[in-house]
Interface confidence: medium
């Protein structure tokens, strides 16, 4: 014979546990129904009556099947430097994240208390470690053979273009400038010779391995107090 389905509340068999979406009520000593997400226990079960559930009030939620006496409060409204990436509903908490280009500079369990703009690396410096939701950009000096001519929170140091003949050598904040190459027998007479790098690299190509004279990685550190262009923030 198939086992009878027990309806809550019921006394569990000795040594057995309550079923999914049920909980054991110590006072009633019965298996009772949990409340669904978006609800909470308004009245706990007894030996003869099951849990009475009620909907969460505005600005409160429960995310799981539960038997809590009151719903959880949604977190504070998002601040002006945050965006609400998940709204407060009866079944989920509000989630605030720092707006694009910003990161969380001070957080607690309740969420981010202060967003700050991502640091911008000045010319001569490139991004060594990109910013995340909770960490700032780390800048590093461009190693010999690489440069960055931007003030940016995303640009890395890029290799200098390689010239046949160098007009102006590159440095940490400027690319090399090539001269026009001398005509060779392989070129048609009268051809226009523009400055021509041997290879072209896209903006986002990783820099070539640094020469042995490059600073060690112990140099990778957040730039210290920096002028506004480098990402420090006022009020």
């Amino acid at each position: 014979l198939p086992a009878q389905v027990a309806f809550t509340p019921y006394a569990p068999e000795p040594g057995s546990t309550c079923r999914l979406r049920e909980y054991y009520d110590q006072t009633a000593q019965m298996c009772c129904s949990k409340c669904s997400p978006g609800q909470h226990a308004k009245v706990f079960c007894t030996k003869t009556s099951d849990t009475v559930c009620d909907s969460c009030e505005d600005s409160t939620y429960t995310q799981l099947w539960n038997w809590v006496p009151e719903c959880l409060s949604c977190g504070s409204r998002c601040s002006s430097d945050q965006v609400e990436t998940q709204a407060c509903t009866r079944e989920q908490n509000r989630i605030c994240t720092c707006r694009p280009g910003w990161y969380c500079a001070l957080s607690k369990q309740e969420g981010c208390r202060l967003c700050a703009p991502l640091r911008k690396c000045r010319p001569g410096f490139g991004v060594a470690r990109p910013g995340t939701e909770t960490s700032d950009v780390v800048c590093k000096p461009c190693a010999p053979g690489t440069f960055s001519n931007t003030t940016s929170s995303t640009d890395i140091c890029r290799p200098h273009q390689i010239c046949n003949v160098v007009a102006i050598p590159g440095n940490a904040s400027m690319d090399a400038v090539c001269t026009s190459t001398s005509p060779t027998r392989s070129m048609a007479p009268g051809a226009v010779h523009l400055p021509q790098p041997v290879s072209t690299r896209s903006q986002h190509t990783q820099p070539t391995p640094e020469p042995s004279t490059a600073p060690s990685t112990s140099f990778l550190l957040p730039m210290g107090p920096s002028p506004p262009a480098e990402g420090s923030t006022g009020d």
Epitope: S73, C74, S79, A105, R113, L114, P225, D235
Partner: antibody
Framework: QVQLVQSGAEVKKPGASVKVSCKAS????????IDWVRQATGQGLEWIGE????????YYNEKFKGRVTMTRDKSISTAYMELSSLRSEDTAVYYC?????????????WGQGTLVTVSS | DIVMTQSPDSLAVSLGERATINCRAS??????????MHWYQQKPGQPPKLLIY???NLESGVPDRFSGSGSRTDFTLTISSLQAEDVAVYYC?????????FGQGTKVEIK
């Protein structure tokens, strides 16, 4: 306007406990922290800890851990600070203060203070 | 814990003159270009009152003769022209990390 109103003065014996209340009004109680700070007569300010009323999460100064309990009753917008195993050096004015979750990260509104005297 | 040390312990200034209070933290209270340092004023029998938050921001309703400056470990509260009602004890406080800590206070009096 934001207001924090604390319970009245207390006289306690050493070893006893005291529970100070702080009723908030003029803002959404569950949105911001309530901090507790004490000040012995003629002395400076000492931070005891804080509670986030929305979740009930607490952050205690290690110095008071094991002796302090911060709770809240959201239905009446009131925060409580209970200090147990009282000793004479706990005699002080106890203040509650609001600290906004965002922005200032400072205590911008304070209760009037509650004098707790510990004496045998 | 971050230790906050104020100087001087007390200060006597003539009415209309400038008063300067310093506060030094045992380690940096800066994070990402923000200084989590605040200044409070406390008059006898009253709770403290927030004057300056995050090093240099004037709290609403506070007279603009009060100003704050500094970063990392060294901070200053300046009263540009001392008034009789400014007689009080002034405290600095850091909220960069728990436990939040206060300076020992600086008593400002009229000379």
């Amino acid at each position: 306007q934001v207001q924090l109103v604390q319970s009245g003065a207390e006289v306690k014996k050493p070893g006893a406990s005291v529970k100070v209340s702080c009723k908030a009004s003029g803002y959404t109680f569950t949105d911001d922290y309530i901090d507790w700070v004490r000040q012995a007569t003629g002395q400076g300010l000492e931070w005891i800890g804080e509670i986030y009323p929305g979740s009930g999460n607490t952050y205690y100064n290690e110095k008071f851990k094991g002796r302090v309990t911060m709770t809240r009753d959201k239905s009446i917008s009131t925060a409580y600070m209970e200090l147990s195993s009282l000793r004479s050096e706990d005699t002080a004015v106890y203040y509650c203060a609001r600290s906004q979750v965002y922005g200032k990260i400072a205590m911008d509104h304070w209760g009037q203070g509650t004098l707790v005297t510990v004496s045998s | 814990d971050i230790v906050m040390t104020q100087s001087p312990d007390s200060l006597a200034v003539s009415l209309g003159e400038r008063a300067t209070i310093n506060c030094r933290a045992s380690e940096s209270v800066d994070n990402s270009g923000n200084s989590f340092m605040h200044w409070y004023q406390q008059k006898p029998g009253q709770p403290p009152k927030l004057l300056i938050y995050r090093a240099s921001n004037l709290e609403s309703g506070v007279p603009d003769r009060f100003s704050g400056s500094g970063s990392r470990t060294d901070f200053t509260l300046t009263i540009s022209s001392l008034q009789a009602e400014d007689v009080a004890v002034y405290y600095c406080q850091q909220s960069k990390e728990d436990p939040y800590t206060f300076g020992q206070g600086t008593k400002v009096e009229i000379k």
